[in-house]
């Protein structure tokens, strides 16, 4: 099939006091090969400091996956989700409030 770029969605949730968990989800993409990682100041976090989801079919002939990490509240600006798929790349910031979901479709 032809290339379908991912929708990228970054959310945040409360973790322990002073910390938040940030999750980056990529969905509706094809083919399944994708790089999705959290960056701190533009530098990828070590694998063992991120939690990873499998790349799974989402039922529409496309795929989905996610990656999460824990950060200090107030340091959201330092963190971005980096995505690379089929030769295209993008970076996605952490939303400033926990009530908004940010969706971006990348071509």
């Amino acid at each position: 099939g032809s290339t379908v770029p991912p929708m990228v969605n970054v959310t945040r949730s409360e973790a322990s006091e002073g910390n938040i968990t940030v999750t980056c989800r990529a969905s509706s993409f094809y083919p399944r090969n994708i790089i999705l990682t959290w960056r701190q100041d533009g530098v990828s976090l070590s694998h063992d400091t991120q939690q990873w989801g499998d790349v799974l079919p989402d039922g529409n002939g496309t795929y989905q996956t996610w990656v999460a990490t824990r950060i200090c509240r107030g340091e959201e600006q330092r963190f971005t989700c980096y995505m690379e798929h089929s030769g295209n790349h993008s970076t996605h910031p952490v939303p400033s409030g926990n009530s908004h979901h940010h969706h971006h479709h990348h071509h």
Partner: antibody, heavy 118, light 112 residues
């Protein structure tokens, strides 16, 4: 080959401003942040800040807030460090640098010498 | 700001010697998620610094295996197992776990 080409030396008067450029080649410019580091003569290194060329977002050392402005021109793959209200304390070599996958300053420019003198 | 204290400031060596440089941070540089952004750089006269070690103990590409990094929390060490002439210069530790990022004051490795 990945390279960061910096602009030439600058001699400026106290109170003036200066704009140092850093032109990237050999990679997709928007993939990696550009960092700026100051080194006064015979001294250690001092982190100024960084810019994400993809979003234009910046994080800076508070010590330089209001004095240093970081910008990029994506069309020419060039990052800029603009320093204003210069004093003799700003006389230094200014480096741009680029991170890699898991490291901060994997590639460095050759440095730009800024001399502030009347 | 996190202060990075390097010792010694000067390290006279004979070629072939082992050299050890210590770097101590004023507070832990282990980030909330477990990431420790501690790096080591070598700067030779008239040159830009060059990366040796990243994330405490990982050698950068092209760096000889005589260089090794170790440590955790607040105490970090760079070791050179057998010093060669090309290793002479000023070594800096650097932390990027917390803003502002900070460098150590440097350790000059020179011939005895």
């Amino acid at each position: 080959e990945i390279q960061l080409q910096q602009s030439g030396p600058e001699l400026v008067k106290p109170g003036a401003s200066v704009k140092v450029s850093c032109t990237a080649s050999g990679y997709a410019f928007t993939k990696y942040n550009i960092y700026w580091v100051k080194q006064s003569h015979g001294k250690s290194l001092e982190w100024i800040g960084y810019i994400d060329p993809y979003t234009g977002g910046t994080i800076s050392n508070q010590k330089f807030t209001g004095r240093a402005t970081l910008t990029v021109d994506k069309s020419s793959s060039t990052a800029y460090l603009h320093l204003n209200s210069l004093t003799s304390e700003d006389s230094a070599v200014y480096y741009c640098a680029r991170p890699g996958s898991y490291w901060y300053f994997g590639v460095w420019g050759a440095g730009t010498t800024v001399t502030v003198s009347s | 700001d996190i202060l990075m204290t390097q010792t010694p400031l000067s390290l006279p060596v004979s070629l072939g010697d082992q050299a050890s440089i210590s770097c101590r941070s004023s507070q832990s540089i282990v980030y909330t998620n477990g990431n420790t952004n501690l790096e080591w750089y070598l700067q030779k006269p008239g040159q830009s610094p060059k990366l040796l070690i990243y994330k405490v103990s990982n050698r950068f590409s092209g760096v000889p295996d005589r260089f090794s990094g170790s440590g955790s929390g607040t105490d970090f060490t760079l070791k050179i197992s057998r010093v060669e002439a090309e290793d002479l210069g000023v070594y800096y530790c650097f932390q990027a776990s917390y803003v502002p990022f900070t460098f150590g004051s440097g350790t000059k490795v020179e011939i005895k």
